[in-house]
Interface confidence: low
């Protein structure tokens, strides 16, 4: 039978390098040869290009070398297999060269920030060092911050006489490392070189874009003065490398603006003493460039009830995240204040704190947070000026079996009864929310039972037991991810009881 | 490794011009700028102008007025700058540097050995 | 253009010596400053770039530090072979300029 005709011919032009075609060679039963056979310089000249490899996929592709290459030039190509049955032809194609060149990435090497102008940085390059004289390039650079993923994209041309090599990258973030990369065409070209080499530079710093201010408010003290921390951090979406000099602080009571305080920190937390009534606290970062836009905050009077409306809240962990969802019964309140601290017995010096607008869940990467710790972790409705009553929950971000099993005593030993007492296990080692205790017990020499009792339970009474036998028992604390055993205690029945 | 060899010292009268040639070898010529830099006796150092071999894109110190030309040939893998209208205090010493592009922008990693350009009458 | 203002021009140290000089420039340049240092009838020899990037085979001692418009190249113990003169270069954009230089001389 006749070779099958070959199929999806495409052609691409290694600048200064080789023609390369490339085509489908359809199934073939015998041993084909391809020929490719072109026309170029405008027409004026032809020649063959045949294959000579065994394999089929090689006999499918040909290339032409320098010096038989020409740009600009249009070529028609076409391929002819031929197999002991005889020859037959694909359709003619078409090529202009200039629209399938393709050439090296082009070499960035410098990304700098210009003096004064915001927001931008300018890339400059060297074009490949073998690129079309007579053609202009075409150009995609590429770009993200160091810390994101995805890419944004620009695509713009540059002149063949065009000796700047540079392009001005705008609408940028302030002070913001980013990573750039640039690839090049022919302008007429369907083929993109490779992507450059990545390379970083950064934008001009600018004045503190804003701040975030939250407090957290202590009981009064004995002269009816109440102490509160005032902390704050760069607002969401700020540069990552942004710095700040200083904060300026000013705080009123809102029934009279005229008893403003104002004080200077470089802490990003401030302890306040502020009477019973409402307070205003306002603040600002400030660098060399300038200040960012006022913060503000309302402290509530001490005697001031707050509103209530979060009904329910669970948090459970889902695809390496911790996620805290809630039920609200005001549909108006849309934005929340999540606070967190790991719960240890000391004062909590690790509050971390985070807004959510427009939902009722929150979720933070479970490497964010410390494995086998309990975290405290409050939720406050935030309407208008007015902060509402947290709700709070316990969570763990990762569960593991407590480093330590329950201290186990053994009490009121009676002929047939005994008491098994316990303590809860120290929150530094429980690893997890312990969710049931399980008392294993066993005569000398005899079968082993147990009992499991859930977690608000610190003693269990065992019946039913032998006179004058050796018990040994031991109780087990379980979490999510299994159990520790307390050391084991023995005991022994009585031989008879002061009522026989 | 990478080498920058300059021609040799020349003794020229006020008024004439001067041309300096610095071979490159050991890197891809066309990758790198080609910066040139003076000393006068006893004096700092002086930046004249650069060259970027791959499309011979110039830039010069403003301060030479017209007066100095740098060029490149790529087939040789050589840059040169020409100084004319030469006047006494055009007596330094004249050297080649590649641009750090490996190592830091407008930075000058490999110096020629400098040719010494005498202006007397 | 950007002005270099190196100092001092020349100062007088001892083998082990903790030495500093200062560039300070006439606009802000972030980090791009180098130091060079020359030796008598020798070419500079880059030593620092990005204001403390040491370039490559120059001994750890060699130090810069700066950013905006105040820069310094420290040598924490000075040796023998270092007597010889510094100079800064902004490499920010053309046209390039050199500080004065500093003479490090022997005490």
């Known amino acids: 039978a006749l070779p099958a005709k070959p199929e999806n011919i495409s052609c691409v032009y290694y600048y200064r390098k080789n023609l390369t075609c490339t085509w489908s060679p359809g199934k073939e039963t015998s041993y084909t040869q391809y020929t490719v056979k072109r026309t170029y310089a405008f027409g004026e000249k032809h020649d063959n290009c045949t294959t000579n490899s065994s394999t089929s996929e090689n006999r499918a592709s040909c290339s032409f070398f320098l010096p038989r290459i020409t740009i600009p030039d249009n070529y028609t190509i076409e391929v002819e297999a031929e197999n002991g049955d005889g020859v037959i032809k694909s359709h003619m194609t078409y090529w202009r060269l200039e629209n399938i060149a393709k050439t090296e990435p082009p070499k960035i090497f410098r990304v700098k920030p210009v003096l004064g102008i915001k927001r931008m940085i300018q890339i400059e390059w060297i074009k490949p060092e073998l690129a079309p004289v007579s053609s202009d390039l075409k150009y995609t650079l590429r770009f993200r911050t160091v810390n994101s993923t995805s890419w944004m994209e620009v695509n713009f041309a540059k002149n063949r006489k065009d000796k700047n090599q540079t392009y001005n990258l705008t609408g940028l973030q302030p002070f913001t490392e980013y990573v750039i990369a640039l690839r090049c065409a022919v302008k007429e070209s369907k083929f993109w070189s490779d992507w450059s080499q990545e390379k970083m530079g950064m934008t001009e710093e600018e004045a503190p874009c804003g701040l975030e201010l939250w407090r957290v408010l202590k009981p009064a003290e004995a002269d009816g003065r109440r102490p509160v921390r005032l902390l704050w951090k760069k607002a969401r979406g700020a540069p990552v490398l942004e710095k700040t000099l200083g904060y300026n602080i000013w705080y009123y009571p809102e029934s009279n603006t005229n008893l403003t305080e104002t004080m200077n920190t470089t802490n990003q937390q401030l302890e306040l003493h502020l009477g019973g009534e409402s307070f205003w606290v306002s603040m600002i970062s400030y660098n060399s460039l300038g200040k960012s836009p006022v913060a503000t905050l309302r402290i509530p009077a001490i005697q001031e009830k707050s509103f209530q409306c979060i009904e329910v809240m669970q948090a459970c962990v889902a695809e390496d995240q911790l996620v805290v969802k809630w039920q609200s019964s005001a549909l108006d309140v849309n934005t929340w204040m999540i606070e967190w601290f790991p719960d240890v017995d000391s004062e909590p010096t690790t509050l971390s704190w985070e807004s959510v607008s427009q939902a009722t869940n929150w979720t933070i990467q479970q490497d964010k947070l410390k494995p086998f710790w309990c975290y405290n972790i409050s939720v406050y409705p935030m309407l208008h000026d007015k902060v509402g009553e947290p709700y709070s929950i316990q969570a763990y971000a990762k569960e593991g079996v407590p480093s330590e099993g329950p201290e186990t005593k053994v009490e009121n030993i009676g002929v047939k009864t005994v008491t098994i007492t316990w303590k809860e296990i120290p929150k530094s080692e429980r690893k997890g929310i312990i969710c049931n205790y399980t008392i294993f017990y066993q005569a000398e020499g005899g079968k082993g039972f147990s009992k499991t009792v859930n977690s608000s339970i610190l003693q269990y009474g065992l019946e039913s037991l032998k006179r004058k036998t050796s018990y040994i028992v031991q109780v087990m604390a379980s979490t999510s991810a299994g159990g520790t055993n307390g050391t084991s205690i023995n005991f022994k029945t009585l031989s008879f009881s002061v009522f026989e | 490794q990478v080498q920058l060899v300059q021609s040799g010292a020349e003794v020229k009268k006020p008024g004439a011009s001067v041309k300096v040639s610095c071979k490159a070898s050991?890197?891809?010529?066309?990758?790198?700028?080609i910066n040139w830099v003076r000393q006068a006796p006893g004096q700092g150092l002086e930046w004249m102008g650069l060259?970027?071999?791959?499309?011979?894109?110039?830039d010069y110190n403003q301060k030479f007025k017209g007066r100095v030309t740098i060029t490149a040939d790529e087939s040789t893998s050589t840059a040169y700058m020409e100084l004319s209208s030469l006047r006494s205090e055009d007596t330094a010493v004249y050297y080649c540097?590649?641009?750090?592009?490996?190592?830091?922008?407008?930075?000058?990693?490999?110096w020629g050995q400098g040719t010494l350009v005498t202006v007397s009458s | 253009d950007i002005q270099m203002t190196q100092s001092p021009s020349s100062l007088s140290a001892s083998v082990g010596d903790r030495v500093t000089i200062t560039c300070q420039t006439s606009?802000?340049?972030?980090?791009?400053v180098a130091w060079y240092q020359q030796k008598p009838g020798k070419a500079p020899k880059l030593l620092i770039y990005n204001a403390k990037t040491l370039a490559k085979g120059v001994p750890s001692r060699f130090s810069g530090s700066g950013s905006g418009t105040d820069f310094t190249l420290t040598i924490s113990s000075l040796q023998p072979e270092d007597f010889a003169t510094y100079y800064c270069?902004?490499?920010?954009?053309?046209?390039?300029?050199f500080g004065g230089g500093t003479k490090v001389e022997i005490k």
């Open positions: 606009e802000n340049i972030y980090r791009f």
């Open positions: 540097a590649r641009d750090g592009y490996d190592d830091g922008p407008y930075t000058m990693d490999y």
């Open positions: 050991g890197y891809t010529f066309t990758g790198y700028v």
């Open positions: 060259i970027n071999p791959y499309n011979g894109g110039t």
């Open positions: 270069q902004h490499h920010y954009d053309s046209p390039l300029t």
